[in-house]
């Protein structure tokens, strides 16, 4: 059969039926529906809202709908024995103490189960002593203390900045620099645009707010006690101190009007440039400790907080391919929030929700997708993106081989600028061709297209007349499919104007503010985004999984894999010497590169050219474009990161959130004019050198006329 | 618009015990610390106790300590302050404030609202 | 304890005119600090936070400066109204809150 056979619709029809379906207000019904109460991972409160999809997605017309349930390590507050931080007085007493929770938003007063902030998966502890202010924590923050200012962390309690990079990275540099406590604040500077309100009267950050997040450094090994296995009913746990990426020093959240009270006291050194202040009224002083009159006072944190093996639940469901049943094209978000989740992540669950209800109709109208569409409903992702490693970990042998791509869908927006997009470089075209055919929601581009009012208000760097597409980093749900398996992923959400607001995220990110009202009220009354992101979701979705040749283009990833070879080249070329003494030659990866490029190309005339009549050739030109992003995958993975295997995107070793390219070699290279064995250090650049070289020819030969 | 309303006052005895209460409407109470501020006949203000709107912070001046206690009920929008072993130099008029804090373009400590005050006598 | 002090305790103005009352703390305060009025029988108003911020409402006429341990309050052209006790105070080092003694304004 082919895929017009698999439809009574007209098939230039499918698509724009399926996009016509697609209803705003749809959306902010569902938004409403999923917001009014906390749906915490391994809550009753999150079970139940799963069972709720569940249903309503087998009313949409899905196949079949089933829960997939797991027993992960998660965190939570001690509910008698809060969480907190005090300024202690040489006798001991507490002067001051930060709050227990955030005033809660009009409306939600007698809400109940609003978990207090905390970092998920602190330990327990009490420690006592001087602040000292690290900026945002990242590691040049760290060399900037420890190598130009001579101030030593050892011993002391650090207070982080939120912002530029993961918290999880923030708390790893904190303990690899000796302290013994941290605490993560919200700085004004990055989480209040000037000229807004705070909440409820606007969608700025109140002086009470804070954001909550986990502080895993799990490098893409899911529930902590089960890496590379699915945490199921006879599961083999590792003990807690055996456990993968848990901090080992307590870590808690506040908001900047305790910070405040905590900072204002400071003394020490003065901060070392302007880079180091927010905005507060404070001097922004490193410490350690308080100055002058404040000597004698101390910082002391109270952490109580357990972590406990809980059950979570992922829905999955089924839309069967009627010609390529054993090919899946993924589209998945998760259903668990910190708080109400107005934003993180039910923007996104509507979306989904609003997205399976209109290909359900479609399938009731007698309507099949060329291949099997799976929506994933997952859970925990605020845990450390639990639910879907573990489905995957359960799944990988099947994914792996019939893994079409993966379209992420968490937050529809963390602004209502213009839209974003991070992907694999084989679905640059599809990006682009659907955003052509979509209409721009944007003030000034009526009657434009999304594509226009994206490429002026965000242009590529690097190609006049082209949007910007950023790499895929992780912090979210196609880590494990991308990162692991090698499976093409995407994801799209609207954003925010970067040049104008430099704050971090979206001012109430992780709050308690994060509510339906914040949406309907301050981001998108009129829900236009969410319908623009259900459309470029779902339609991504729908061409991945209705098109008859796959729409990934090779010759996209031949570009972006010269453009990664320059970049990491001319970081080695900041050593000059070295790599002369080392004998240390870019060659092979320039020539490997060099030949993708050329195999690519051909593969790309023999795509136009071939018979789509014939479905055993048509299948094999697909299954080489769909195991081309396989082919990146080494499977010993990364140094010390052993499910971050794609050797050409990693997460950054310095920022989870960002992805770095040629990620080995970049690795090897930083700092390592510190290193104090530099044959050893230059001998695995080469070494990763090696690596790069022979995926990239690999990958092309798989590129190759098969016979 | 903002309300802050004092009752409570009186003639007492000294060494015998008062409640003050401040009833408090026109704004989210939930989120705000409240204070209380007496002010003798005739004399300057003294700041007597805050309460932090979460009761994670509970102060007094060194004058009461140990006498008054600050507290709040956030479901009935009150602020109380529990008067005990009054002395004659307690004798004033005690208002309840609320501070302004809230967000990064507001000061913390800072009354911005004042309620009319009630008058507490301590007198044989 | 911060001791904040005030100067004059009280003075005499005519209507139109400008005064200027100070305000010294004991020890720097950065910009954490208050002015309020009060007048007879009432509460307290918040005119001035945070040394210089106008509180919404206030006519443009009172403004604040300073900075670390000396302060002023500036009434430019006084209207009928403005005869009242003035007051500093410090949020700085709390707690204790701790007030000036109070400035009185006067009709000459």
């Known amino acids: 059969k082919s895929s017009n056979e698999a439809t009574n619709i007209t098939p230039k029809h499918n698509m724009k039926a399926f996009l016509d379906e697609l209803k705003a207000e749809n959306i902010k019904k569902f938004l409403y529906n999923f917001t009014q109460i906390p749906h915490l991972a391994g809550t009753e409160q999150n079970f139940q809202l799963a069972k709720q999809i569940q249903s309503q997605w087998k009313e949409f017309g899905l196949d079949s709908v089933e829960l997939a349930h797991y027993d992960v390590l998660l965190s939570y507050p001690n509910k008698t024995h809060p969480n907190y931080i005090s300024i202690i007085n040489e006798d001991g007493n507490e002067i001051f103490n930060t709050s227990l929770f955030e005033p809660p938003p009009p409306g939600y007063e007698n809400v109940s189960d609003i978990v207090p902030p905390f970092s998920a998966f602190s330990p327990q502890g009490m420690p006592e002593g001087d602040l000292v202010y690290v900026n945002y924590a990242r590691t040049e923050d760290f060399f900037k203390l420890e190598r130009d200012m001579k101030i030593n962390c050892s011993g002391k309690i650090v207070i982080a900045r939120y912002g530029k990079v993961f918290r999880g990275n923030k708390v790893k540099n904190a303990q690899l620099a000796g302290a013994k406590g941290v605490i993560l604040y919200s700085d004004p500077a990055d989480y209040f645009a000037p000229g807004v309100k705070s909440y409820p009267d606007g969608w700025n950050l109140p002086g009470g707010g804070v954001q909550r997040g986990n502080i895993l450094n799990l490098n893409g090994a899911g529930d902590p006690l089960t890496p590379g296995y699915p945490a199921n009913e006879y599961a083999y746990r590792r003990g807690i101190a055996e456990a993968v990426g848990l901090p080992s020093i307590p870590v808690h959240p506040i908001g900047y009007y305790d910070a405040q009270k905590l900072l204002e006291k400071m003394g020490g050194s003065a901060p070392p440039d302007s880079s180091w202040r927010g905005s507060l009224k404070v001097p922004y002083n490193v410490g350690p400790g308080f100055t002058g009159n404040f000597s004698t006072q101390k910082v002391k944190m109270h952490i109580h907080s357990t972590n406990e093996v809980t059950r979570i639940y992922n829905v999955i469901g089924t839309l069967r391919g009627a010609v390529e049943p054993d090919r899946y094209v993924i589209l998945g978000g998760h259903r668990d929030s910190w708080v109400f989740g107005g934003i993180d992540p039910q923007s996104g669950a509507a979306v989904v929700h609003e997205i399976v209800r209109s290909f359900g109709t479609l399938k009731k109208e007698g309507w099949r997708p060329r291949r099997t569409i799976l929506f994933a409903s997952w859970d925990a992702e605020e845990f450390g993106l639990l639910g879907s490693t573990e489905w995957a970990e359960e799944n990988s042998r099947l994914l792996q081989e019939r893994g079409v791509a993966y379209i992420n869908a968490d937050s529809s927006i963390e602004g209502n600028y213009t839209l974003r997009v991070d992907c694999t470089p084989l679905m640059y075209s599809l990006v682009h061709n659907l955003t052509k055919e979509l209409k721009s929601p944007d003030e000034g581009f009526e009657g434009k297209s999304l594509y226009e009012s994206w490429t002026k208000k965000s242009p590529s760097p690097e190609f006049s007349g082209m949007p910007r597409i950023s790499k895929l980093g992780s912090g979210n749900d196609f880590e494990v499919f991308f990162q692991r398996l090698g499976i093409a992923s995407g994801r799209a959400r609207y954003t925010k104007n970067w040049e104008t607001n430099k704050f971090s995220g979206y001012p109430l990110y992780h709050s308690v503010y994060e509510t339906y009202e914040l949406v309907e009220k301050f981001y998108d009354p009129m829900f236009k985004y969410h319908l623009t992101v259900a459309q470029v979701r779902g339609g991504m979705v729908f061409e991945l999984a209705n098109s008859i040749v796959l729409p990934f283009d090779c010759r996209d990833y031949a570009v972006v894999l010269r453009k990664y070879a320059d970049k990491i080249y001319s970081i080695s070329m900041k050593h000059p010497q070295e790599m002369k003494t080392y004998s240390v030659s870019f060659d092979s990866l320039f020539s490997a590169v060099k030949n993708f490029t050329e195999i690519a190309s051909k593969f790309s005339e023999r795509l136009q050219d071939f018979d789509k009549s014939n479905p055993i050739v048509l299948r094999m030109m697909n299954d080489q474009l769909m195991f081309l992003e396989r082919a990146f995958i080494d499977p010993l993975g990364l140094p010390d990161r052993p499910f971050y295997r794609h050797v050409i995107y990693a997460p950054s070793s310095h920022n989870k959130y960002a992805g770095e390219s040629f990620p080995g070699i970049y690795d090897a290279l930083f700092d390592i004019e510190s290193k104090v064995d530099p044959s050893k250090a230059w001998g695995e650049v080469k070494r990763q050198i090696y690596v790069a070289a022979f995926t990239v020819q690999a990958a092309a030969e798989t590129l190759s006329e098969v016979a | 618009q903002v309300q802050l309303v004092e009752s409570g006052g009186g003639v007492v005895q000294p060494g015998r015990s008062l409640r003050l209460s401040c009833a408090a409407s026109?704004?989210?109470?939930?989120?705000?610390?409240m204070h209380w501020v007496r002010q003798a006949p005739g004399k300057g203000l003294e700041w007597v106790a805050f309460i932090s709107y979460d009761e994670s912070n509970k102060h007094q001046a060194d004058s009461v300590k140990g006498r008054f206690t600050i507290s709040r009920d956030n479901s009935k929008n009150t602020l109380y302050l529990q008067m005990n072993s009054l002395r004659a130099e307690d004798t004033a008029v005690y208002f309840c404030?609320?501070?302004?804090?809230?967000?990064?373009?507001?000061?913390?400590?800072?009354?911005?609202?004042w309620g009319q005050g009630t008058l507490v006598t301590v007198s044989s | 304890d911060i001791q904040m002090t005030q100067s004059p305790s009280s003075l005499s103005a005519s209507v139109g005119d400008s005064v200027t009352i100070t305000c010294r703390a004991s020890q720097s305060i950065n910009n954490y600090l208050n002015w309020y009025q009060q007048k007879p029988g009432k509460a307290p108003k918040l005119l001035i936070y945070?040394?210089?911020s106008l509180l919404s409402g206030v006519p443009s006429r009172f403004s604040g400066s300073g900075s670390g341990t000396d302060f002023t309050l500036t009434i430019s052209g006084l209207h009928p109204e403005d005869f009242a006790t003035y007051f500093c105070q410090q949020s700085f080092s709390t707690p204790p809150i701790t007030f000036g003694q109070g400035t009185r304004l006067d009709i000459k």
């Open positions: 026109g704004f989210t109470f939930r989120s705000y610390g």
């Open positions: 404030a609320k501070d302004q804090y809230y967000d990064f373009l507001t000061a913390y400590d800072t009354l911005d609202y």
């Open positions: 945070t040394a210089s």
